[in-house]
């Protein structure tokens, strides 16, 4: 079940996911001056079974100016399966990292993709928040949000995070901005 809304917006903060639940969709967005190829899928989809999850479809961008002489900047269809396998294998090369069951990892980049990715999340997805550069975090609780189903409707829990300018007085004296912990998760996730 897709979440009806985007995760909550927190002023001066961004959110990220560690992994993506099956059913998540990623828009195939291209940078300025490029567009999705006509035969290309508009999105990638996280699919899988009990033992393995992966992204279906591939995003491909081509120059907006190109006409009949369009040069594909990603593999031709017959090459895609082999290339995709290689790309996915290349993502797994860090040792001691176990994939979450029922989740896809971050899809590899594609040529000329837009800088910011647009995901459509499903119920059960968790995203994590941090303040942007130049702002510090004031916490009342975990800086995360979970998409939940309540009475047949989806909603995101409210992350307990306020981001304040570094020169502004703290509302919660003694609180420091948490640095990400060694495994890459925000402190609120690892210290509960």
């Amino acid at each position: 079940e897709l979440c009806d809304d985007d995760p909550p917006k927190i002023t001066h903060a961004t959110f990220k996911a560690v992994a993506y639940k099956e059913g998540t969709m990623l828009n195939c967005e291209c940078k300025r001056g490029f567009r999705r190829i006509k035969s290309g899928s508009p999105y990638m989809l996280c699919t899988g079974n009990s033992s393995h999850s992966s992204w279906d479809n591939q995003c491909q961008c081509t120059s907006s100016a190109a006409r009949n002489t369009t040069k594909q900047v990603t593999p031709q269809p017959e090459e895609q399966k082999e290339r995709k396998t290689t790309e996915m294998q290349s993502q797994m090369q860090l040792a001691d990292q176990v994939s979450l069951p029922g989740h896809c990892r971050e899809p590899p980049p594609w040529e000329n993709e837009a800088t910011e990715r647009i995901y459509h999340f499903v119920v059960g997805q968790t995203v994590y928040y941090q303040c942007v550069q130049g702002y510090r975090a004031l916490h009342r609780g975990p800086a995360e949000s979970v998409c939940k189903m309540t009475h047949g409707k989806t909603r995101w829990t409210q992350p307990q995070l306020i981001c304040t300018g570094e020169t502004e007085p703290s509302q919660f004296p003694g609180e420091e901005e948490p640095q990400a912990s060694p495994d890459g998760l925000p402190e609120s996730e690892t210290s509960r």
Epitope: T14, K16, V18, A19, K31, S90, Q91, Q93, L94, Q97, R105, E106, P108, P109, N112, E113, T115, E116, R117, Q130, V132, Q133, E177, Q179, A180, S181, D183, G184, L185
Partner: nanobody
Amino acid sequence: QVQLQESGGGLVQAGDSLRLSCAASGFNFGWHAMGWFRQAPGKEREFVATITWTGRDTYYADSVRGRFTISKDNAKDTLFLQMNSLRPDDTGVYYCAKARERATWAYSEDDCDYWGQGTQVTVSS
């Protein structure tokens, strides 16, 4: 302010290994994707490898896949590039780069907002 300082470059023989490091400061290193790029003499800067904010996922240029390994230590604010089976065409200045706030990967130069000064790697045959 944001600072990225590469180290570990040098002159090696073909087939040797090198490990580059990039010490980061002035930003929340654990929250950002990072990348390595290189520039050979007379050529444009090109993508080498990138890693997501968590350090879980990596991606490589075809020319280095299977020989180079990117990693990041979020506890020590340091990015690494382990380079094995070096070849003469790996010669160049290697730069580490910080991904923009909302970028998932440091894959293209557009994805990055801060760069180190670079470290020279020379591979002789």
